[in-house]
């Protein structure tokens, strides 16, 4: 799994006219780790893994680059001409990633009232538009006011991609977090499913970082793919990830059956409760 | 109809530049894309040598790094390679094409490195 | 940089019959950054698949992409004479570009 760093910025617009503020959230590793608080227009750690994440450094920093990134933004949808009566949105994804072979990746997304209408790889430029007809007009006008834009303020997409990897960088390089290894609690159960049969549901929690093999094997043997049902791997909100696999078996063959799981190097088998 | 035709001379000596130009019709070079050079040596795979983008951001092979230059006159619509030290090893078609899934290319020019 | 690796390199086939080429990657790419070419003898490539599954202007629907993450494969369904050729992948993830080393298809 890559490391990432995520933002997620919104603003709106009321009949035509740009509203003040904007809305922000950032993830790291697919975990929210802040937000704008538009109250007091200061980023804001989510929850105490995030304040671990930069110790006792302050969020000026990120505060400042919300509040840069949330103007342009807000300058963008200005510039979309077919903004008719009512609320609209303009909302910017931007994501860099650290692969483990240390390539990187960087893109961004832009969505107008929840629709995707234009992408960029940034490392190579190359932007991308949905076969749309509101897709490629719009996408004609954002990228055209940001060429315009880059052309007068010198600055650049590139220079984009680079700061959110040496945010990432910084944020791997001071966290002890990011570089922990919490194994999961697994937990097997069953529960009646048609006659005869049962189902048997894995689950394992609290673990970091994100990779895990969860599988059910019979005999020693991993059953196949579409014998098996998945769950997401999913944040639990400590700063740590939660999943599940399921499998339905024949009832009285249950001590057969193991649920095996694989992170960071451990592993460990976990019988059916009778 | 977007066209690309790569020019400049077939004979290299080792040690020199290699100079290679290549003009577009049908397409602005400034107007979107990556303007690619790729070259292929006799018998051999299809190398990605760098591109200059259309708003002018150049992108290289590190394996070529030290030694290359891509440039652009948007007055005439072209696209350069220069290519330094050459050796022998730089003998190859060398091909221009255009975007990311290059969906234009020039018919190649064959570029010998000898003395 | 990402490595593809093609296979098989050489694929003997006759007419009629359905080829499968695949390429494997070293790191996760982008589907949409994802391409095929076609190369005959003295001829530049010409793009043959575009966005893992999207097919070039003119090119034929026998032709067909799939994959996603590492693995990719291109498969032309009915193999016509004029399919004869090598065929590269190649991504556009991230800087370098590369291709794969090529799949020569050789009538059998």
């Known amino acids: 799994e890559p490391h990432s760093l995520r933002y997620n910025l919104t603003v709106l617009s009321w009949d035509g006219s740009v509203q003040s503020g904007f809305l922000a959230e950032v993830h790291l590793d697919g975990q929210p780790f802040l937000r704008y608080d538009r109250q007091k227009c200061r980023a804001k750690p989510q929850g105490q893994w995030a304040e671990d994440v930069l110790g006792n450094k302050t969020w000026d920093r990120e505060t400042r680059d919300l509040t840069g990134n949330g103007k342009d933004l807000r300058m963008t949808l200005a510039h979309i001409k077919d903004q008719k009566e009512g609320l609209h949105s303009l909302q910017e994804i931007r994501v860099c990633e650290i692969h483990e072979d240390n390539s990187t990746r960087s893109s961004q997304h832009f969505y107008y009232d929840g629709e995707l209408f234009l992408s960029q790889n940034v490392e190579t430029e190359e932007w991308t538009v949905p076969q749309s007809s509101r897709a490629q007009t719009l996408a004609m006008n954002v990228r055209n006011f940001l060429k315009e834009d880059a052309m007068k303020t010198k600055t650049h997409y590139h220079a984009m991609h680079a700061d959110c990897l040496q945010e990432l960088r910084r944020y791997l390089e001071s966290s002890v977090v990011l570089r922990r290894r919490v194994p999961p609690m697994v937990n097997v159960t069953r529960s009646e499913a048609s006659e005869g049969n049962i189902t048997v549901t894995c689950r394992a929690s609290s673990f970091y970082p994100r990779n895990i093999t969860l599988t059910w094997r019979q005999d020693g043997v991993s059953l196949s793919h579409d014998t098996q049902q998945w769950g997401d791997v999913l944040p639990d909100g400590n700063g740590t990830y939660q999943t599940w696999v399921a499998t339905r078996i024949c009832q009285g063959e249950e001590q057969r059956f193991t649920c095996y799981m694989e992170h960071s190097g451990n592993h460990s088998t976990h019988p059916v409760p009778s | 109809q977007v066209q690309l035709q790569e020019s400049g001379p077939g004979l290299v000596k080792p040690s020199e530049t290699l100079s290679l130009t290549c003009t577009v019709s049908g397409y602005s070079i400034t107007s979107d894309y990556a303007w690619n050079w790729i070259r292929q040596p006799p018998g051999k795979g299809l190398e990605w040598m760098g591109f200059v983008s259309y708003s002018g951001t150049t992108k290289y092979n590190p394996s070529l790094k030290s030694r290359i230059t891509i440039s652009r006159d948007t007055s005439e619509n072209q696209f350069s390679l220069k290519l330094s030290s050459v050796t022998a090893a730089d003998t190859a078609v060398y091909y221009c094409?255009?975007?990311?899934?290059?969906?234009?290319w020039g018919q190649g020019t064959t570029v010998t490195v000898s003395s | 940089e990402i490595v593809l690796t093609q296979s098989p390199a050489t694929l003997s086939l006759s007419p009629g019959e359905r080829a499968t080429l695949s390429c494997s990657a070293t790191s996760s790419i982008s589907s949409i950054y994802f391409h095929w070419y076609q190369q005959k003898p003295g001829q530049a490539p010409r793009l043959l698949i575009y966005r893992t599954s999207n097919l070039a202007s003119g090119i034929p629907a026998r032709f067909s992409g799939s994959g996603s993450g590492t693995s990719y494969t291109l498969t032309i369904s009915s193999l016509e004479p004029e399919d004869f050729a090598v065929y590269y992948c190649?991504?556009?993830?991230?800087?370098?570009?590369?291709f794969g080393q090529g799949t020569k298809l050789e009538i059998k």
């Open positions: 094409a255009r975007g990311y899934g290059f969906d234009y």
């Open positions: 190649q991504q556009g993830t991230t800087i370098p570009f590369t």
